[in-house]
Interface confidence: low
């Protein structure tokens, strides 16, 4: 599995952002496909669960991302993206996208560095 993400992303506090993760695989996409999103805060705190997909999407039931993350992927089109709503400054950090599609071997985990800013273009 090969994972493709944009290296960095900046978004304005209070807005919604699409965390794009696409992938390629020699194996056809089927019911064995799983997608896991995690978050590493900028301050170096523990990694946190964001989202899991296996046949159906599973959103976090508690924690910082409860009711703020939704599936926006399309496995048949090799898309494992999610939407994150109502950005907060403490959403700053690294989001990882891991796709497993047996029998294909696991690939490198995709990373997106998200910077939440007051206004885009550094006008803070």
């Amino acid at each position: 599995v090969e994972i493709y993400t944009s290296r960095v992303l900046e978004a304005v506090n209070g807005t919604d952002v699409r965390l794009k993760c696409t992938f390629s695989s020699f194996a056809p996409v089927g019911d064995a496909l799983t997608v896991t999103w995690n978050f590493r805060p900028l301050d170096g705190g523990p990694e946190q669960f964001v989202f899991y997909y296996h046949i159906d999407p599973f959103r976090p039931m508690s924690g910082r991302f409860k009711d703020r993350v939704v599936w926006d992927g399309n496995p048949e089109r090799y898309d494992a993206s999610i939407l994150l709503w109502k950005l907060q400054f403490d959403d700053n950090g690294t989001y990882t996208c891991q796709v497993k599609n047996p029998p294909d071997v696991d690939g490198v985990i995709g990373e997106i560095r998200l910077s939440v800013v007051h206004t885009v273009r550094f006008s803070e």
């Epitope: 090969e2 493709y4 944009s6 960095v8 390629s24 900028l42 800013v117 550094f122 803070e124």
Partner: antibody, heavy 116, light 106 residues
Amino acid sequence: QVQLQQPGAELVKPGASVKLSCKASGYTFTNYWMHWVKLRPGQGFEWIGEINPTNGGTDYNEKFKRKATLTVDKSSSTAYMQLSSLTSEDSAVYYCTIYTTALDYWGQGTTLTVSS
Amino acid sequence: QIVLTQSPALMSASPGERVTLTCSASSSVGYMYWYQQKPGSSPKPWIYVTSNLASGVPARFSGSGSGTSYSLTISSMEAEDAATYYCQQWSSNPPTFGAGTKLELK
């Protein structure tokens, strides 16, 4: 506006160490990873590594792990890169840079000359 | 690490000519970034995420590609386009750059 200020040049002797600085202004220093890139004439750019200004966490290119040490001083919004055991191979222009989605900001670069 | 090979290394183009610079990756990458650098200046971001023009870049520039093959195209060469262009990938650590294509005005 965003500025990354670097000294223009450094001259050091082989075997010595040098600490290059990059003073950031015009944005929130802790919001963006600071990267360092090496440019040798005729050899292209090499990514050295990056540092998270919030907690000092680093990620290095394996090639530079024993050569470069990245640090920051949040109080002065300054990033540093220390290069050790210098040889002529380390003579190059060193840039600090921050990456955003659509725009990168680069310092003017410090020309490091290693010569006896 | 992923090796990016740019071709040609040196190219001359006349004003108004269509120019295509290529960047080939040793293995598949998700996106490509391009920089323009002129002597004595820092690199300028030129094209990001394969096909998006950075702020201030003229519309005569375009980027395209996928997998291991990417390109930067100038639809009509102008004198100010003479510079060295570098490609960069960020799909795999460490990020790597091509050796550059020096574009000269004929």
